[in-house]
């Protein structure tokens, strides 16, 4: 439905508070280096303009598109060329090319300082002094570091952030109340950001059809009692929402997400029995709750899939007449019967089915040709099952830290060209699959593990895309979205890799390691492990374990010493010499 003024329409729909928050997120996600104050100024100007359009939709410039209005505003930033270099060239373009240009310059790994958490009293004072600025700053800092963060969900995080401070700054023990909440928000936020990044990568790199297929599979698992037509409607609407958010159209995205939540709650009887509690919550909580809702129970007595998709004489007729609808129905029917499968496995099965029909529906004997298609699914199902079983056994045997180390070694040997910080970050996250998923019963392990691994491997893909260094990573990342994990799993040691020159500086440690948190100390050790493997890719597990054990003992010893720095200097030299000897460097 056309509106005379798009900006007025969105302002009225969303309300001033959400409007301002979303514009701030949008601007911070585009101009990630700009100071907070500059963004606030731009947002205030846009908001004032929007109010004039609400008052009179025919006022000057009110008929302009949001991209035009926002792009024009961003292009007024004085330091654009100095701060962003070639991104400034976007401003010479017309819409829609200008917005596309801004999108292409979003940086998944911006050169920004790590967010250091101030003392609790300092934070509480800042919160009380100026609550609005304090919360805006949160939105700004998260948005600029996570340029694809799902904007309406970030509003939900901000609401929880505010609630945490409101409650805990009045508590007797502020820190005990606040810090766990902030840790939880941080961890959930990182996970949310990574999940959304995969959705955007799916849309941008593989197209709408790939995203829709993912959505059909996931929603069919979640709402197995819903009819195919209902699931299709939800998929269409959800695709629109995510296309908008991934495209920087955050006002439209938030508005459409609210409409979708409203529709789902109005039609919950025909969607899922699990929505009741979600639908009683306020908007932001409601949308979040729906997105995380547990799978509904499968309808009883679902017939065999073979009847419609193998045995029917109309398989090829139905497929040829509406390929995507027929494949969508197959995916829906398979997914609603298999909440125990990962979405990516379901998509692999659908792809196999599609490939078989493409072949067999042009064959002289189509039925004989596709009669055994379901037999082809068996190895596809068994591969992730076996992999998860093996890795969960390894996780249970080693614990998270050592399991991460095993993965660090494995992945460094596969793709040693990748930067050490990226290998550490990705392998640590891959390793978290153990504590996240191995505790689940068999029926929940695969959807938990493999779909989580898809999210983590996407992080590797987007970081690698920024600075490509490995053809193998590029190949696994670009050939097939659903086969990324099997592609990486299948990689063996890269025999073409020329070992890195030994540099003693890489293995020189100082007393500051003693004051680091356990997590930071692990990262230091894991960084050293990656560097070791890069120097000696053919080192055995036993050799690496011996060196790492010596290293752990060395850190522990020197951190207990009276003169820590001297200990690190002297014992460090000995450790490096011993390690070189042990590894034959």
């Amino acid at each position: 439905d056309a509106h005379k003024s798009e900006v007025a329409h969105r302002f009225k729909d969303l309300g001033e508070e959400n409007f301002k928050a979303l514009v701030l997120i949008a601007f911070a996600q585009y101009l990630q280096q700009c100071p907070f104050e500059d963004h606030v100024k731009l947002v205030n100007e846009v908001t004032e303009f929007a109010k004039t359009c609400v008052a009179d939709e025919s006022a000057e410039n009110c008929d302009k598109s949001l991209h035009t209005l926002f792009g024009d505003k961003l292009c007024t930033v004085a330091t654009l060329r100095e701060t962003y270099g070639e991104m400034a060239d976007c401003c010479a373009k017309q819409e829609p090319e200008r917005n596309e240009c801004f999108l292409q310059h979003k940086d998944d790994n911006p050169n920004l300082p790590r967010l250091v958490r101030p003392e609790v009293d300092v934070m509480c004072t800042a919160f009380h002094d100026n609550e609005e600025t304090f919360l805006k700053k949160y939105l700004y800092e998260i948005a600029r570091r996570h340029p694809y963060f799902y904007a309406p969900e970030l509003l939900f995080f901000a609401k929880r952030y505010k609630a945490a401070f409101t409650e805990c700054c009045q508590a007797a023990d502020k820190a005990a109340c606040l810090l766990p909440k902030l840790d939880e928000l941080r961890d959930e936020g990182k996970a949310s950001s990574a999940k959304q990044r995969l959705k955007c990568a799916s849309l941008q790199k593989f197209g709408e059809r790939a995203f829709k297929a993912w959505a059909v599979a996931r929603l069919s698992q979640r709402f197995p009692k819903a009819e195919f037509a209902e699931v299709s409607k939800l998929v269409t609407d959800l695709t629109k929402v995510h296309t908008e958010c991934c495209h920087g159209d955050l006002l439209e995205c938030a508005d459409d997400r609210a409409d979708l939540a409203k529709y789902i709650c109005e039609n919950q009887d025909s969607i899922s029995s699990k929505l009741k509690e979600c639908c009683e919550k306020p908007l932001l909580e409601k949308s979040h709750c729906i997105a995380e809702v547990e799978n509904d129970e499968m309808p009883a007595d679902l017939p065999s899939l073979a009847a419609d998709f193998v045995e029917s004489k109309d398989v090829c007729k139905n497929y040829a007449e509406a390929k995507d609808v027929f494949l969508g129905m197959f995916l829906y029917e398979y997914a609603r019967r298999h909440p125990d499968y990962s979405v990516v496995l379901l998509l692999r099965l659908a792809k196999t089915y599609e490939t078989t029909l493409e072949k067999c529906c042009a064959a002289a004997d189509p039925h004989e040709c596709y009669a055994k298609v379901f037999d082809e699914f068996k190895p596809l199902v068994e591969e992730p099952q076996n992999l998860i079983k093996q890795n969960c056994e390894l996780f249970e045997q080693l614990g998270e830290y050592k399991f991460q180390n095993a993965l660090l070694v494995r992945y460094t040997k596969k793709v040693p060209q990748v930067s050490t910080p990226t290998l550490v970050e990705v392998s640590r996250n891959l390793g978290k699959v153990g504590s996240k998923c191995c505790k689940h019963p068999e029926a929940k392990r695969m959807p938990c593990a493999e779909d989580y691994l898809s999210v983590v491997l996407n992080q590797l893909c987007v970081l690698h895309e920024k600075t490509p260094v490995s053809d193998r990573v590029t190949k696994c990342c670009t050939e097939s979205l659903v086969n990324r994990r099997p592609c990486f799993s299948a990689l063996e040691v890269d025999e073409t890799y020329v070992p890195k020159e030994f540099n003693a500086e890489t293995f020189t440690f100082h007393a500051d390691i003693c004051t680091l948190s356990e997590k930071e100390r692990q990262i230091k050790k894991q960084t050293a492990l990656v560097e070791l493997v890069k120097h000696k890719p053919k080192a055995t597990k036993e050799q690496l374990k011996a060196v790492m054990d010596d290293f752990a003992a060395f850190v522990e010893k020197c951190c207990k010493a009276d003169d820590k720095e001297t200990c690190f200097a002297e014992e460090g030299k000995k450790l490096v010499a011993a390690s070189q000897a042990a590894l034959g460097l």
Partner: antibody, heavy 118, light 106 residues
Framework: QVQLQQSGAELVRPGSSVKISCKAS????????MNWVKQRPGQGLEWIGQ????????YYNGRFKGKATITADKSPTTAYMQLSSLTSEDSAVYVC???????????WGQGTTLTVSS | QIVLTQSPAIMSASPGEKVTMTCSAS?????MHWYQQKSGTSPKRWIY???KLASGVPVRFSGSGSGTSYSLTIRSMEAEDAATYYC?????????FGAGTKLELK
């Protein structure tokens, strides 16, 4: 653009064998059935069989089992048909044709004339 | 195997005249395709999946039918339509062709 280029005319002795080729270009050769069709002078069309180069699967018209052997090579994107124990009845034009969904043949080669004569 | 009987075997039509030829199957088929062949050349796909016109085929041509009875119709004959037309069934192995209808210009 899609092209199917067949090998030249053949004149062979009865009892011998011949292998004719069909070089495909302009499309994903592995993903389409290649069919072979026989046409005798002044007569209709007769389907011999087909191959799916992606995995080598074949279907034959029962009348040509033992007479025709269809193969394909993915690297020069070429399909072949070998005809054995040739008689004058095998003298005909043989045409390769790409098969598509629901079994129609959308592109045809120019035909290879086979003459079996002593 | 399914036998396809085309009729008439030969027919002639004047320019502007409506032309209909039929293809009867010995048992039900899923889809029928039609090919045009002019002397000295390979056949060309003309109508496929019973009723769809192949690329470049004039809209005066149409195809219809189901089960065992199919037809090709030319709304208004033109000189360039003179050729032999073959039907071909899909859905039963082996694939089979009709003997052809030769359409001549009167």
């Amino acid at each position: 653009q899609v092209q199917l280029q067949q090998s030249g005319a053949e004149l062979v002795r009865p009892g011998s064998s011949v292998k004719i080729s069909c070089k495909a270009s302009g499309y994903a050769f592995s993903n389409y059935w290649m069919n072979w069709v026989k046409q005798r002078p002044g007569q209709g069309l007769e389907w011999i069989g087909q191959i799916y180069p992606g995995d080598g699967d074949t279907y034959y018209n029962g009348r040509f089992k033992g007479k025709a052997t269809i193969t394909a090579d993915k690297s020069p994107t070429t399909a072949y048909m070998q005809l054995s124990s040739l008689t004058s009845e095998d003298s005909a034009v043989y045409v390769c044709a790409r098969g598509v969904i629901l079994g129609s043949f959308d592109y045809w080669g120019q035909g290879t004339t086979l003459t079996v004569s002593s | 195997q399914i036998v396809l009987t085309q009729s008439p075997a030969i027919m002639s039509a004047s320019p502007g005249e409506k032309v209909t030829m039929t293809c009867s199957a010995s048992s039900s088929v899923s889809y029928m395709h039609w090919y045009q062949q002019k002397s000295g050349t390979s056949p060309k796909r003309w109508i496929y999946d019973t009723s769809k016109l192949a690329s470049g085929v004039p809209v005066r041509f149409s195809g219809s039918g189901s089960g065992t009875s199919y037809s090709l119709t030319i709304r208004s004959m033109e000189a360039e339509d003179a050729a032999t037309y073959y039907c071909q069934q899909w859905g039963s192995n082996p694939l089979t062709f009709g003997a052809g209808t030769k359409l001549e210009l009167k």
